[in-house]
Interface confidence: low
């Protein structure tokens, strides 16, 4: 339905508070280096303009598209060329090329200082002094560091952030109340950002069809009682929502997400029996709850899949009539029967089925040709099952930190050209799959583990894309979205890699390591481990373990010493010499 003024339409639909928050998120995700005050000024100008359009939709410029209005506003930033370099060239383009240009300059790893959490009393004072500015600053800081964060979900996080401060700043022990809540929001926020980044990568790198296939599989697992046509409608609407958010159209995205939540709740009876509680919540909580809702129970009387998709003599005719709909039905029917499979596995099965039909429907005897197609699924199913079994056993044996170290060594040997910070970040996250998924029963392990690994490997892919250094990473990241994990799993030690020159500075540590948190200390040690492997890629597990044990003992000893700095200098030299000898450096 066409509106005379798009900006007035969205302002009225979303309300002033959400409108301002979403425009701030959009601007911060585009211009990630701009100071907070500059963004607030731009947002206020856009908001005042929107109000004039609400009052009179025929007023000057009110008929312009949101991209035109927002792009024009961003291009008024005086320091655009100094701060952003070639991004300023976007402003010479016309829409829609200008918006595409801004999107291409989004930086997944912006050069921004780490967010340091102030003292609780300082935060509470700031919160009480100016709640609105405090919350806006939260949106700004998250959005600029996570340029693909799902904007309507960030509003939900901000609501929880506000609730935490409202409750805890008047508690007897503010810190005990607030810090666990902030830790939880930080961890959930990072996970949410990474999940959304995969959705955007799926749409932008592999296209709408790939995203829709993912959505059919996931929604069919979640809503196995819903008809195929119902699932298809939800997939179409969900694809629109995520296409908009990934494209920077945050107002439309938030508006359409609210409409989708409304539709789902109005049609619960034909979708899922698990939605009742979600649908009683306010909008932001409702949308979040629906996105996380548990799988409904499978209908009891589902017939065998083989009848429609293998035994039927009409398979090729049905496939030819409407290929994507027929494959969509196959994926829907398979996924609703298999909540125990990962989405990526289901997509691999559907791809195998499609490839078989393409080949067999052109054969002399199609039915004879595709009769055994389900047998081809067996190895595809067993591969992730075995991998998860082995890795969960290793995790249970080692614990999270040492399991991460095993993965650090494994991945550094596979792709040693990748930067050390990226290898540490990605391997630490890969290692978290253990505590996240291995506790689950068999039936829930694979969807938990493999779909989580898809999210983490996508982080590697987007970080690597910014500065490509490894053909192997590029190959695994670009060839097939659903085969990324098997592709990385199959990589062996890179025999072409020339070991890094030894640099003593890399292994020089100072007393500041003693004041770090346990997590930061682990990262320091893991950084050293990656560097060791880059110097000596053929080092055995035993050699590396011996050096790491010595390193841990060295840090512990020097942190207990009276003159810590001297200890680090002297003992450090000994450790480096001993390590070189142990590894033959």
């Amino acid at each position: 339905d066409a509106h005379k003024s798009e900006v007035a339409h969205r302002f009225k639909d979303l309300g002033e508070e959400n409108f301002k928050a979403l425009v701030l998120i959009a601007f911060a995700q585009y211009l990630q280096q701009c100071p907070f005050e500059d963004h607030v000024k731009l947002v206020n100008e856009v908001t005042e303009f929107a109000k004039t359009c609400v009052a009179d939709e025929s007023a000057e410029n009110c008929d312009k598209s949101l991209h035109t209005l927002f792009g024009d506003k961003l291009c008024t930033v005086a320091t655009l060329r100094e701060t952003y370099g070639e991004m300023a060239d976007c402003c010479a383009k016309q829409e829609p090329e200008r918006n595409e240009c801004f999107l291409q300059h989004k930086d997944d790893n912006p050069n921004l200082p780490r967010l340091v959490r102030p003292e609780v009393d300082v935060m509470c004072t700031a919160f009480h002094d100016n709640e609105e500015t405090f919350l806006k600053k939260y949106l700004y800081e998250i959005a600029r560091r996570h340029p693909y964060f799902y904007a309507p979900e960030l509003l939900f996080f901000a609501k929880r952030y506000k609730a935490a401060f409202t409750e805890c700043c008047q508690a007897a022990d503010k810190a005990a109340c607030l810090l666990p809540k902030l830790d939880e929001l930080r961890d959930e926020g990072k996970a949410s950002s990474a999940k959304q980044r995969l959705k955007c990568a799926s749409l932008q790198k592999f296209g709408e069809r790939a995203f829709k296939a993912w959505a059919v599989a996931r929604l069919s697992q979640r809503f196995p009682k819903a008809e195929f046509a119902e699932v298809s409608k939800l997939v179409t609407d969900l694809t629109k929502v995520h296409t908009e958010c990934c494209h920077g159209d945050l107002l439309e995205c938030a508006d359409d997400r609210a409409d989708l939540a409304k539709y789902i709740c109005e049609n619960q009876d034909s979708i899922s029996s698990k939605l009742k509680e979600c649908c009683e919540k306010p909008l932001l909580e409702k949308s979040h709850c629906i996105a996380e809702v548990e799988n409904d129970e499978m209908p009891a009387d589902l017939p065998s899949l083989a009848a429609d998709f293998v035994e039927s003599k009409d398979v090729c005719k049905n496939y030819a009539e409407a290929k994507d709909v027929f494959l969509g039905m196959f994926l829907y029917e398979y996924a609703r029967r298999h909540p125990d499979y990962s989405v990526v596995l289901l997509l691999r099965l559907a791809k195998t089925y499609e490839t078989t039909l393409e080949k067999c429907c052109a054969a002399a005897d199609p039915h004879e040709c595709y009769a055994k197609v389900f047998d081809e699924f067996k190895p595809l199913v067993e591969e992730p099952q075995n991998l998860i079994k082995q890795n969960c056993e290793l995790f249970e044996q080692l614990g999270e930190y040492k399991f991460q170290n095993a993965l650090l060594v494994r991945y550094t040997k596979k792709v040693p050209q990748v930067s050390t910070p990226t290898l540490v970040e990605v391997s630490r996250n890969l290692g978290k799959v253990g505590s996240k998924c291995c506790k689950h029963p068999e039936a829930k392990r694979m969807p938990c583990a493999e779909d989580y690994l898809s999210v983490v490997l996508n982080q590697l892919c987007v970080l690597h894309e910014k500065t490509p250094v490894s053909d192997r990473v590029t190959k695994c990241c670009t060839e097939s979205l659903v085969n990324r994990r098997p592709c990385f799993s199959a990589l062996e030690v890179d025999e072409t890699y020339v070991p890094k020159e030894f640099n003593a500075e890399t292994f020089t540590f100072h007393a500041d390591i003693c004041t770090l948190s346990e997590k930061e200390r682990q990262i320091k040690k893991q950084t050293a481990l990656v560097e060791l492997v880059k110097h000596k890629p053929k080092a055995t597990k035993e050699q590396l373990k011996a050096v790491m044990d010595d390193f841990a003992a060295f840090v512990e000893k020097c942190c207990k010493a009276d003159d810590k700095e001297t200890c680090f200098a002297e003992e450090g030299k000994k450790l480096v010499a001993a390590s070189q000898a142990a590894l033959g450096l």
Epitope: F228, A229, E230, K233, T236, N318, E321, V325, F326
Partner: nanobody, 115 residues
């Protein structure tokens, strides 16, 4: 909620014509291929005809080729089946479906060809 409502059926003499309609709602009609299937008394479902999402590509079962024409109007979210030269063996309940699906929606519309 997804709804497909068939209409236009009735009693017609052999050689006569009917035009069936299927009004669709609750999903993005223009994004999907659609089909007509039918079920004769005491028989299983039989696929009749299919059309792609844009209306350019149409398919027919051998038994109706040259007599039936499938079409669609995406602006009205409606699927049609023009049936000419009707025969007694065309007597059935006709259903429209999304894609070519074993599931069916709506009540169907009954076509009886008899003198």
């Amino acid at each position: 909620e997804v709804q497909l409502v068939e209409s236009g059926g009735g009693l017609v003499q052999p050689g006569g014509s009917l035009r069936l309609s299927c009004a669709a709602s609750g999903f993005t009609f223009g994004s999907f291929g659609m089909s007509w299937v039918r079920q004769a008394p005491g028989k299983g479902l039989e696929w009749v005809s299919a059309i792609d999402s844009g209306g350019a590509d149409t398919r027919y079962a051998e038994s109706v080729k040259g007599r039936f024409t499938i079409s669609r109007d995406n602006s009205k979210n409606t699927l049609y089946l023009q049936m000419n030269s009707l025969r007694a063996e065309d007597t059935a309940v006709y259903y429209c479906t999304i894609g070519r699906s074993a599931s069916r929606w709506g009540q169907g519309t009954t076509v009886t060809v008899s003198s």
